[in-house]
Every structure is written in structure tokens, then in C-alpha cells.
């Protein structure tokens, strides 16, 4: 019958950053196509990426409906040129994904330093609040809206003339740090969810920003 030459997908992997979530799998298709289904533990299966020759499927629209749910996906393999027929009873080969809980597992995207302002021996460093595709009443929510006090930022700062780094932490998006007058400093920030116990607890470091460049402002 029609599915005997198809190969089940394997290595199903979730790739997710700031809730932008893509399911990837293997193999690259030869004479076959794929359809993905996703569901919550208690919900119905919903089909996505119908009869695709790709080996990835963007499931963001589904998971952002409730980022605190746990999701399962499965990938069905069909012969190339397959057309859904009402008379077909044979289930195509498929493979299940690992479970995925976006709130606990999405990676934190690389943060950005929005600005810094020096007033005397104090510098205020502001981290840009990243937007996500999670919505509330048709409004997109920021990372801070979703994670609240679960999300903190770590600031690394050092004198341009030396390599010794200092750190500061905030559960807002702002740091107020003491600096030596007349010295230029460089800054980098990292997003952290302290309640996580896994490798996705921290983001990568932001690009380094240094005083004396356009993001900064100095007032005596």
C-alpha cells in the first residue's frame, strides 16, 4: 500500500528561543513528505505543516496559546505526491517528539543593552525588554510580562583599561552602579531565570557596549 516505502522521522528536536518554537527532525526526505501534529497532554491533535518536504515546522502559533502547558508533537511520513483519501485506513509511520514545556524550556534570547547614562560616579544601564509572540488581548507581551520576577539580569562591567570584571544583578531591567570618575567602562548583560536548574537557565551575553560610544550619555 501507499506508505510501505516511507521512513519514520527520527531525532525530533525542539528549538525554542523567547517562545519562537520550531520542531526539527530527520531525515531529509527522499520520495516522501511530512505532516506534523501537536497537542497538549489533555487536548486534541492539531495538524500543521501539511505534506511538507521540509524537516522543520514552526509551532510557535500553537505553543503561545498557553506557554505553561506541556506539549507533544508527532511527525507523520507519507509518500511524495500523497493526497489525503477518505478511504485510506492504514496509519502512516510516525515518531513522537519529547515533551516540551515552553515556560520551563524556551531558551532566553541574547539581550541588548538599550542605553547607559552616567551622572557623576553613577551609571544607569538599561536592558531592552524583548518582545515575544505570546499575546494577551491581542497585545504582544514582553519577556518581562511573561516571566515577571522569575527573570533577572546580570551585568558584567569593567574598566576599558583593565580586564577585571565586576557583576551586578537586578530583577528589573535597570542597573545603577558606582564607577570611578574619569574612567571609561564597558558593559555586557545576561538574562537569567534562577529557578531553572538546566542548561537553559542563562542567555548568551549581550554584545559589549562601552562608554564613549553613541549608546551612552554623560552628565556631570
Amino acid at each position: 500500500s501507499g506508505t510501505t516505502n516511507t521512513v519514520a522521522a527520527y531525532n525530533l528536536t525542539w528549538k525554542s528561543t523567547n517562545f519562537k518554537t520550531i520542531l526539527e527532525w530527520e531525515p531529509k526526505p527522499i520520495n516522501q513528505v511530512y505532516t506534523v501534529q501537536i497537542s497538549t497532554k489533555s487536548g486534541d491533535w492539531k495538524s500543521k505543516c501539511f505534506y511538507t518536504a521540509d524537516t522543520e515546522c514552526d509551532l510557535t502559533d500553537e505553543i503561545v496559546k498557553d506557554v505553561k502547558q506541556t506539549y507533544l508533537a508527532r511527525v507523520f511520513s507519507y509518500p511524495a505526491g500523497h493526497v489525503e483519501s477518505t478511504g485510506s485506513t492504514e496509519e502512516p509511520p510516525y515518531e513522537n517528539s519529547p515533551e516540551f514545556t515552553p515556560y520551563l524550556e524556551t531558551n532566553l534570547g541574547q539581550p541588548t543593552i538599550q542605553s547607559f547614562e552616567q551622572v557623576g560616579t553613577k551609571v544607569n544601564v538599561t536592558v531592552q525588554d524583548e518582545w515575544t509572540l505570546v499575546r494577551r488581548n491581542d497585545t504582544f507581551l514582553s519577556l518581562r510580562d511573561v516571566f515577571g520576577k522569575d527573570l533577572i539580569y546580570t551585568l558584567y562591567y569593567w574598566k576599558s583599561s583593565s580586564s577585571g570584571k565586576k557583576t551586578a544583578k537586578t530583577n528589573t531591567n535597570e542597573f545603577l552602579i558606582d564607577v570611578d570618575k574619569g574612567e571609561n567602562y564597558c558593559f555586557s548583560v545576561q538574562a537569567v531565570i534562577p529557578s531553572r536548574r538546566t542548561a537553559n537557565r542563562k542567555s548568551t551575553d549581550s554584545p559589549v557596549e562601552c562608554m564613549g560610544h553613541e549608546k551612552g550619555e554623560s552628565r556631570e
Epitope: K68, T70, V127, R144, F147, K149, N173, R197
Partner: antibody, heavy 120, light 113 residues
Framework: EVQLVQSGAEVKKPGESLRISCKGS????????IEWVRQMPGKGLEWMGD????????NYNENFKGHVTISADKSISTAYLQWSSLKASDTAMYYC?????????????WGQGTLVTVSS | DIVMTQSPDSLAVSLGERATINCKSS????????????LTWYQQKPGQPPKLLIY???TRESGVPDRFSGSGSGTDFTLTISSLQAEDVAVYYC?????????FGQGTKLEIK
């Protein structure tokens, strides 16, 4: 329907140990913080601490740290508040509550409360 | 720790009249990242657990009657009941939901005059 069901009232003597429970249902237990709140007779609300069952991460109010332990068993969707040695001053109503869906959006659901009486 | 102070401690208002409860925090509850104030209001009736009314200082929880409204920013907040009903008799608490430790105001007892 989201529900938090707490264990029944307890009467204990000073120095005894106690564990009270809070069972969550109707939602994904691992992704919401469970909060514990004390209310002494005729008094206001005091936040004791919380736990995120998915990771076991906890936060405590310094006023309660070392005196109570917060834990959770995600396999049975239950959070616990325990004392190793009760004092008469622990006599109070204890509530568990679940955090809201959005960040910092309050304690959206509450258990019915567990009354703990400690008396010699 | 952030200290939450409510005023008045008790309040008597006639049915159908406006009731106003104030809450002051010792530090700002405004999150610079998203410009939200992490101030929450609860209602507690005798013998019952508290009930969430308002979060983010002004967002009504689902199912809460629209006579309840919250306002304010930074350190000064207000809960307003536009037209008091008999079932609104309760103790009202504000809460810092901004940073640990989470702290409550001492409560305001609302009664019918």
C-alpha cells in the same frame, strides 16, 4: 477547573513535627509557583515562601527561613509545608495559592486553608 | 524589604456610595522594562480565603465586577469600589508582587455605614 485542595485541620503539641499538603488540579502543576501564606488569628496575611514544582526552586521569607520547609512532589501534583518542631506561635490558618498565568500577576487561585493549632 | 502601608485601617461607606482604599509602598513597584506596576489587590471575606481582584495595579481579574478598579503608579496606589454593594463587606489587602519577599499591607476593613 483549577483547584487547590489542602489537607485537614491539625492539632499539635509544641515540639512536634507536621507536614500539611496542597494538591493542585486542572492545570499544568509544574509551571506555576505555589505560594504559602500564613494568617494568624484575627491578623493579616504574611507571605512565607513559594516553590516552582517543575524545578523544585524555592524562595523564603527570611522571617520563616529555617523554621519551615517548602517542597513539592510533581508526580502527584502536591506541594507541602512542613515544620520539624512546632511552637505555640505557629497557631494560624495556612493557605496555599497558585501564581497567575502572567508574570507577577498575583495569587490567582487559593486553597481553602489548613488550620493549625499548637497547644500544650 | 518593601513595606506596604494601607489607609485607612477601617472604612464605613453607605450602600451605593464610593469606597476608596489607599496603599503606599516603601519602594517603587514600577518595572522599568515593561512599565507595569506590580501591585495586587485582594478581597477576603470572613471565613474564606482571599480572592484576587486586581493585578498590575489596574488590571481586573477575570470575573471581578467592573465596580472594582485600581489605579496608581510607583509607590502610591488606590482601590476604588464605585458603588458599594452589601457583598463587598470584607477586608482588602494590597500586595507587593514586584520583588521578594512578597509583602502585604496590613489590611483595610470595609463595612456598611
Amino acid at each position: 477547573e483549577v483547584q487547590l485542595v489542602q489537607s485537614g485541620a491539625e492539632v499539635k503539641k509544641p515540639g512536634e513535627s507536621l507536614r500539611i499538603s496542597c494538591k493542585g488540579s486542572g492545570y499544568t502543576f509544574i509551571t506555576y509557583w505555589i505560594e504559602w501564606v500564613r494568617q494568624m488569628p484575627g491578623k493579616g496575611l504574611e507571605w512565607m515562601g513559594d516553590i516552582l514544582p517543575g524545578s523544585g526552586s524555592t524562595n523564603y521569607n527570611e522571617n520563616f527561613k529555617g523554621h519551615v520547609t517548602i517542597s513539592a512532589d510533581k508526580s502527584i501534583s502536591t506541594a507541602y509545608l512542613q515544620w520539624s518542631s512546632l511552637k505555640a506561635s505557629d497557631t494560624a490558618m495556612y493557605y496555599c495559592a497558585r501564581s497567575g498565568y502572567y508574570g507577577n500577576s498575583g495569587f490567582a487561585y487559593w486553597g481553602q486553608g489548613t488550620l493549625v493549632t499548637v497547644s500544650s | 524589604d518593601i513595606v506596604m502601608t494601607q489607609s485607612p485601617d477601617s472604612l464605613a461607606v453607605s450602600l451605593g456610595e464610593r469606597a476608596t482604599i489607599n496603599c503606599k509602598s516603601s519602594q517603587s513597584l514600577l518595572s522599568s522594562g515593561n512599565q507595569k506596576n506590580y501591585l495586587t489587590w485582594y478581597q477576603q471575606k470572613p471565613g474564606q480565603p482571599p480572592k484576587l481582584l486586581i493585578y498590575w495595579a489596574s488590571t481586573r481579574e477575570s470575573g471581578v465586577p467592573d465596580r472594582f478598579s485600581g489605579s496608581g503608579s510607583g509607590t502610591d496606589f488606590t482601590l476604588t469600589i464605585s458603588s458599594l454593594q452589601a457583598e463587598d463587606v470584607a477586608v482588602y489587602y494590597c500586595q507587593n508582587d514586584y520583588t521578594y519577599p512578597l509583602t502585604f499591607g496590613q489590611g483595610t476593613k470595609l463595612e456598611i455605614k
